[in-house]
């Protein structure tokens, strides 16, 4: 199974309707299932059409909370199963709560994608708003990471570091485990120096209401909303 068109991420207002598209192909024609935050989609309507070995699935959602939506295309050839996944994020404009309100726990990073970026044995924050935080966060990074392959060699390592440290934030253990956001200065350096050209493209898409998953992830959070390493050095993570 192979995904031809991945769902696109959206930043919408509370109460909006959003349609996510996922198109896949394979022999035999794959089936498409949708997952919301690691669980089967609990609400929304799904429409499907099949033409010339291509399946098109449309998930219509009424948005009341942000989420990670994964399209999974599966087919079986003989005894072999083949699966392809793509994910998109739905975020709600001005919905995001302060970091300290996040529910989650600290754990050692055990994924693969950010192995080269995160410190060995790094304690990361796993967000329990996902049913399976490790898998959901890893999938988020994985989806974005693949699309980062097309950016410039100057931008890519900086963007990868920002992406991994944004999705798998450093975690401060304690009575209430707390995610430590990236320092504003690093966010700015990635956005305006290392990835300046890529960011311009992203911002044009943003203004037109188009979101590519990796671009959207890298545009959150806003650099200006992050703590400064100069004014509050312990409040943020240096990359």
């Amino acid at each position: 199974a192979r995904i031809l068109r991945a769902p696109e991420s959206h930043n919408v207002t509370f109460g909006s309707f959003v349609t996510l598209h996922c198109t896949a192909t394979g022999i035999p024609v794959p089936t498409i299932t949708w997952i919301e935050n690691g669980n089967a989609v609990s609400s929304g309507s799904i429409q499907e059409s099949v033409k010339d070995r291509v399946i098109d699935s449309r998930l219509q959602l009424f948005i009341t909370k942000p989420g990670l939506y994964t399209c999974i295309a599966t087919n079986k050839h003989g005894e072999k199963f083949s699966t392809a996944k793509a994910a998109a994020t739905i975020s709600i404009a001005e919905w995001s709560k302060p970091q300290k309100d996040n529910k989650g726990y600290c754990a050692q990073y055990r994924g693969e994608v950010c192995n080269a970026v995160l410190a060995k044995d790094a304690l990361v924050f796993l967000n329990t708003s996902y049913a399976d935080p490790e898998e959901a966060q890893e999938l988020l990074v994985h989806t974005a990471w693949n699309e980062l392959k097309v950016v410039s060699p100057v931008c890519r390592p900086a963007a990868e570091a920002l992406l991994c440290n944004h999705i798998f934030q450093e975690c401060s253990p304690g009575v209430v485990p707390t995610p430590i956001p990236i320092c504003r200065e690093y966010c700015l350096a990635v956005k305006e120096l290392f990835c300046a050209k890529e960011w311009l493209v992203m911002e044009e898409k943003t203004h037109r209401g188009l979101y590519r998953s990796e671009m959207h992830l890298l545009s959150v959070p806003e650099c200006s909303k992050l703590p400064s390493m100069h004014w509050d050095p312990t409040a943020c993570a240096r990359l």
Epitope: A189, C223, S224
Partner: antibody, heavy 117, light 107 residues
Amino acid sequence: QVQLVQSGAEVKKPGASVKVSCKASGYTFTSYYMHWVRQAPGQGLEWMGIINPSGGSTSYAQKFQGRVSMTSDTSTSTVSMELSSLRSEDTAIYYCARELGWGSDYWGQGTLVTVSS
Amino acid sequence: DIQMTQSPSAMSASVGDRVTITCRASQDIRNYLAWFQQKPGKVPKRLIYIASNLQSGVPSRFSGSGSGTEFTLTISSLQPEDFATYYCLQHNSYPYTFGQGTKLEIK
């Protein structure tokens, strides 16, 4: 496009104060810090301090502590730098500059302040 | 405060020469150093960010290197328009500090 437009040249007497303004346009004013840098005639660049226009937090170089005050007015997207107890060695071009080290840097055109009796 | 010491303070060179300017920090500043070029009567222009990265639009003959306390700016083949004053800036911590400058003159 991003622009930082500074107020005009000033001539002041020793002991007086001067206020230089820097009006920003072409970007979200509160998203970027503003630095003040000065350059005496024939001399090098000297960092004076910084202001976060969102909230007005400041940090000043030790040399100017007690004599300098940086403020921001979000309604007009303007930052100002006031230097008091002027002496002849404060004669310099004063620049406002956005995000010197970390983001895209933009500079005002400079304001010449002359201190002379 | 972190002191930045630039050397030399002035130098003469010819078109086509390879030129190296050094900047030393009084304590570790990781790689948080920028290089600026200033021509008489003009506003400073950043050439290099975060020690070794070329600012967009700056010719590739300019390069930066170093980390910790020792940094260098190199111009591989000097062009007539490169005669100017060069400054390093540490942005590791407040107060930010500039080096005293290196004036590059035509021999």
